[in-house]
Amino acid sequence: PLATIPVSTTSLTSSEGSTISTPSVDISTPVTTSIVGDQCSRCKNGGFWDGLKCQCLTPYYGESCEEVVNSIDIAPPETVSAQMELTVTVTSVKFTDELKNHSSQEFREFNKTFTEQMNIVYSGIPEYVGVNITNLRLGSVVVEHDVLLRTKYTPEYKTALDNATEVVKQKITKVTTEQIMTNDNCSALMCFNTTGTQVQNITVTQYDPVEECRQKAEEYEDYFLVEYRDQKPYCISPCESGFNASKNCNHGKCQMSQNGARCLCVTTETHWYSGEDCNQGTQKSHHHHHH
């Protein structure tokens, strides 16, 4: 069965010149409703009736999920990180089998001293978080470990983390060149074999706000874009006001369609408005009667 939905209409003219009604429910197509229990189900675009109202999927809203939002929430992570897999060779400790056991007294002590040494090496790198030993093996002690870096998310986060990884490489190369054994003894906290220092792999957090924006905009992906305000990304359509890409509809209302943003121009008591941006006003003749 068909149901009639009461709507309030405003007389608007599209920029092409035809007068159309723009109610809170889009009535350009008939709304087919079906009885679900005692409720009418009339949710479009994948929305569902929760018993009281339509629950709409992004990027839709409205009584029947027929309108497209002007902005979509995207949430970049507060912090982004990088993990560097490194190997160094410690010569000031003789390897024993107990070092393989991460719960042993020997491993715990080695871990504490190594961490302390690396905290000294990397002091001055604001992104440095810490080190994590992944494996110890013979030769004297070959230390496979991760260096963890973290920074606040900004649009330039990749550059910040790339720079930090370069400084890590410089610092570990320097310390493993300088802190070496002399006469079979070490006078530093730890000594190293210069040739045993290797960077195996670097993994950086991947976050692309443009990609998230496009995914959430679905079939409107070509018309939503990312703009930054106070280093925070916003996923907006041109109908969202206050941004560089905002569309100015002057005497009209911006509406998203599958062909992009368009202006729906208003008709007042005295004027018709037209043009792509509803900025061309035509005064109504005095003898014209508006019904």
Partner: nanobody, 124 residues
């Protein structure tokens, strides 16, 4: 955790001898490092000697070579320092240090466990 208790300090005349002892407890292995450090008034703490309890390594500072002997009794878990031909410049607080690792470092910061120290005074 590892506990270290030194004994044997005292006053001795130049050329005399003393034997320091350090009793260790809390080790889960019978293979570890022990050392003697000393600190004279107004000076930094410096290594005197260290030993690996498996017998694999001993080290002496140049200033004590030929005069001091470091040893370890595995059955008693005790470290010793036999000091002969003592000199005035040997006057210091002597500390026992230990590590569960087989260390080859003379930097005191690398040694995690310490005794309270025993005073050795060489004076006529």
């Amino acid at each position: 955790d590892v506990q270290l208790v030194e004994s044997g300090g005292g006053v001795v005349q130049p050329g005399g001898s003393l034997r320091l002892s350090c009793a260790a407890s809390g080790y889960t292995s019978n293979r570890y490092s022990m050392a003697w450090f000393r600190q004279a008034p107004g000076k930094e703490r410096e290594v005197v000697a260290f030993i690996w309890t498996d017998g694999g390594r001993t080290y002496y500072a140049d200033s004590v070579k030929g005069r001091f002997t470091i040893s370890h009794d595995n059955s008693k878990n005790t470290l010793y320092l036999q000091m002969n031909s003592l000199r005035a410049e040997d006057t210091a607080v002597y500390y026992c240090a230990a590590s569960s690792l087989l260390l080859q470092t003379i930097n005191p910061r690398a040694w995690p466990y310490w005794g309270q120290g025993t005073m050795v005074t060489v004076s006529s």
